[in-house]
């Protein structure tokens, strides 16, 4: 059974992940000129089911495409702290949260999503898991 300290650690990691994802989304939404409409032409794959920490495998598999899109956006006056570091940090948290003992094959939904829909989905996931821990 999870101890209170491990639950607290999980909660803090999820909150960190949540903040990172929200920072990316805010960077997209708060950029006053919608010059970043081209980012919406990139598609992302969504999990069929995302209710447990192990489902973060689906987020992990999409981090490379996410990094590529954000790198392309950087050259269009979209300013985010170093994308490589940010994605690397997210990756580290995701690996710790999902655990490496069980390798899950991610099951994707049929429908793909824009970067905004993708980020919102994983933000909701984090918020949902955090609420169950508190």
């Amino acid at each position: 059974a999870p101890t209170s300290s491990s639950t607290k650690k999980t909660q803090l990691q999820l909150e960190h992940l949540l903040l990172d994802l929200q920072m990316i989304l805010n960077g997209i939404n708060n950029y006053k000129n919608p010059k970043l409409t081209r980012m919406l032409t990139f598609k992302f794959y969504m999990p069929k089911k995302a209710t447990e920490l192990r489902h973060l495998q689906c987020l992990e598999e999409e981090l490379k495409p996410l990094e590529e899109v954000l790198n392309l956006a950087q050259s269009k006056s979209f300013h985010l702290r170093d994308t490589k570091d940010l994605i690397s940090n997210i990756n580290v948290i995701v690996l710790e949260l999902k655990g490496s003992e069980t390798t899950l094959m991610c099951e994707y939904a049929d429908e793909t999503a824009t970067i905004v829909e993708f980020l919102n989905r994983w933000i909701t996931f984090c918020q949902s898991i955090i609420s169950t821990l508190t």
Epitope: P34, T41, T112
Partner: antibody, heavy 116, light 108 residues
């Protein structure tokens, strides 16, 4: 209601210059890209380039770079496509369209005929 | 330069299902969009982001995408659907727009 109204048909001789226009209304013109698309007689659609009227940032298709100039005057909500020296092969319908990651609203098209 | 490939023509009888394909190497990661262009008219968006239908577009129009292939499906094609159909996407960078060569749909 979003509208893009283009200037009328033009008949020109080879070597002449030309500037056609596209006036936007019903939305914030400065915060959407405007694209230009060429359609030669009996042929398909070709993307020429886009401009962001807010700061005149412009991207051209490699096929049209150096052949045309795309500009905009945000004070009058108008985008332009111009040629300094027309060729017979420039004969086509030219469409402007609002770009939201894809072209959601289109102008009615401007027919340009270049003939000696 | 990036290319999108469509069949030049597709023919169906009224009421039949018409399928128009579009292939491109970047389509696993880039959305496809579809335009209908009737003779002498400006193009009209019929499908965006692979499968979404703008308001005002009949339900018989649908889109799908798998791997490097996007498909526009017209279920129960009608005579008024006779037109040229163009797929549209962007290159890997997202900067340059590409149209497919167009498909002439004939509803006999």
């Amino acid at each position: 209601e979003v509208q893009l109204v283009q200037s009328g048909a033009e008949v020109k001789k080879p070597g002449e210059s030309l500037k056609i226009s596209c006036k936007g209304s019903g939305y914030n013109f400065t915060t959407y890209w405007i694209g230009w698309v060429r359609q030669m007689p009996g042929k398909g659609l070709e993307w020429m380039g886009i401009i962001y009227p807010g700061d005149s940032d412009t991207r051209y298709s490699p096929s049209f770079q150096g052949q045309v100039t795309i500009s905009a005057d945000k004070s009058i909500n108008t985008a332009y496509l111009q040629w300094s020296s027309l060729k017979a092969s420039d004969t086509a319908i030219y469409y402007c369209a609002r770009d939201t990651g894809y072209f959601d609203y289109w102008g009615q098209g401007t027919l340009v005929t270049v003939s000696s | 330069s990036y290319e999108l490939t469509q069949p030049p023509s597709v023919s169906v009888s009224p009421g039949q299902t018409a399928r128009i394909t579009c292939s491109g190497d970047a389509l696993p990661r880039k959305f496809a969009y579809w335009y209908q262009q009737k003779s002498g008219q400006a193009p009209v968006l019929v499908i965006y982001e692979d499968r979404k239908r703008p308001s005002g577009i009949p339900e018989r129009f649908s889109g799908s995408s798998s791997g490097t292939m996007a498909t526009l499906t017209i279920s129960g094609a009608q005579v008024e659907d006779e037109a040229d159909y163009y797929c549209y996407s962007t290159d890997r960078s997202g900067d340059h727009v590409v149209f497919g060569g167009g498909t002439k749909l004939t509803v006999l």
